[in-house]
Interface confidence: low
């Protein structure tokens, strides 16, 4: 029953952000990511540069709710989506067995006293194969249509070369040429893999959530914050921040 | 106060399979998930994976899948892990360890030794 | 998977010293990492979080800094209780994995 009032009370929220004074903090993400069909993926967001408190953290797909940490009540992942998804590492979620369909954008938004709320966008790209980096725990991506693409022009220019050959020897040196130029330049161009998740940069007033420390003190706070749901304090999740 | 409590030591023969229990009390058990660390004599630990009551979600160090099973009964708050086809490089003692939002083991179990005799 | 290199493996020093362990990640994990005691026959023991953060209860003289790729954790006023190994653990990515160990001995 606690958790059908805080899905509405946080949708309510998304739609109406708290905003009492000015918002310092910025959301550091892993930003945009790819993954290998059937793979997991952590997607990993960072509240700096701010000394509010976290009261809530939640995972959203496009409009659907992936999870919530809340203070009081610890993690909740919804129904749809409990065989897929797990908490962390750290205010991170784990995605598994992940589908083409699982591409697109996800949101962190973090829901903050007295600042209000925060939202951190990380765009995911589910690929259908990718080469994996020997000993990595993550699949470096490939880029499908660049590398579809590098194929056909590849294999134009092979035609082309062996319908010449006969023809026009000499200008079988000058095709490789371009071909080794045109190579080197879509390796220059194509962008190199994403930082590991999480790796953001990290700042010098860094803020966590933090589930699992029994500080009573910062449940006691949340109870004003709360107190529309008459929450009973769990002490499952104790979020507070550092400033240094 | 929050605690997780392992079930006894285990002398098992080579090839059998044995399972650990973690019964844990004090905080909302499905809030948070139980971790497997491995310790042989002496040395140092290694986290084996771990599975989300909450949901049944597990993870798993790929060193140890099919190895390690983890499942939960949310009922008695009880973690267990089944270890499967053991030999003598199993012999060590596992921990338990909740695991939640920073990134870090805030409380262990007891420990439960594992001898795997031939 | 991100190795932990932690040094030195073992150490000795005397009661009132201050000593530094270190610890090194092969790749970025920005301030994810904790540190534990495992005093002998016993269980690891919670003392660093977030890679400067005091675990509740854990005395003033334990303290850690760093963060990326390197990160130390310091004793000060060394006292008899702190003979035990001291593991760091980082949290950024799968499978977790632990530095190898620092056994401190007293003089």
């Known amino acids: 029953m606690r958790w059908c009032l805080l899905l509405i009370w946080a949708q309510g929220l998304r739609q109406a952000p708290l905003a009492s004074g000015m918002m310092t903090g910025t959301i550091e993400t892993t930003g945009n990511i790819s993954a290998e069909k059937g793979g997991s993926i952590i997607l990993q967001c960072h509240l700096s540069s701010t000394t509010a408190q976290v009261t809530q953290v939640n995972w959203e797909q496009q409009d659907q709710l992936l999870a919530i940490c809340n203070a009081d009540l610890g993690w909740h992942i919804s129904p749809s989506f409990k065989d897929r998804v797990a908490p962390g590492p750290g205010l991170g979620l784990t995605l598994q067995s992940l589908t083409v369909n699982d591409t697109g954008e996800y949101f962190c938004i973090y829901h903050t006293y007295p600042d209000g709320t925060y939202t951190g966008r990380i765009f995911l790209e589910v690929l259908e194969s990718s080469v994996a980096e020997h000993g990595a725990r993550f699949q470096i991506p490939l880029l499908g249509a660049m590398a579809a693409t590098l194929v056909v022009i590849c294999t134009a220019v092979i035609v082309v070369v062996a319908l010449t050959r006969k023809k026009k020897a000499l200008r079988i040196h000058s095709v490789e040429g371009d071909l080794r130029r045109k190579s080197a330049g879509q390796e220059e161009w194509s962008p190199s893999a994403p930082s590991p998740p999480g790796s953001c940069v990290q700042a010098e007033a860094a803020p966590a959530g933090l589930c699992g420390e029994q500080r009573g003190e910062d449940c006691a706070e949340l109870h004003d914050y709360f107190n529309v749901l008459s929450y009973r304090s769990l002490g499952n999740c104790s979020f507070f921040t550092e400033t240094g | 106060q929050i605690q997780l409590q392992q079930s006894g030591p285990e002398l098992v023969k080579s090839g059998a399979s044995v399972k650990i229990s973690c019964k844990a009390s004090?905080?909302?058990?499905?809030?948070?998930?139980i971790n497997w660390v491995k310790q042989r004599p002496g040395q140092g630990l290694e986290w084996i994976g771990w599975i989300f009551p909450g949901s049944g979600s597990t993870n798993y160090n790929e060193k140890f899948k099919g190895k390690a099973t983890y499942t939960v009964d949310k009922s008695s708050s009880t973690a267990y892990m089944l270890l499967s086809s053991l030999t003598s490089e199993d012999s060590a003692v596992y921990f338990c360890a909740r695991y939640g939002l920073g990134h870090y083991f805030d409380y262990w179990g007891q420990g439960t030794t594992l001898t795997v005799s031939s | 998977d991100i190795q932990m290199n932690q040094s030195p493996s073992s150490l000795s020093a005397s009661l009132g010293d201050t000593i530094t362990i270190t610890c090194h990640a092969s790749q970025n994990i920005n301030v994810w990492l904790s540190w534990y005691q495992q005093k002998p026959g016993n269980i690891p023991k919670l003392l660093i979080y977030?890679?400067?953060n005091l675990h509740t209860g854990v005395p003033s003289r334990f303290s850690g800094s760093g963060s990326g790729t390197g990160f130390t954790l310091t004793i000060s006023s060394l006292q008899p209780e702190d003979i035990a190994t001291y593991y760091c653990q980082q949290g950024q990515s799968y499978p977790l994995t632990f530095g190898g160990g620092t056994k401190l001995e007293i003089k």
């Open positions: 004090g905080y909302t058990f499905t809030a948070y998930c």
């Open positions: 977030k890679a400067s």
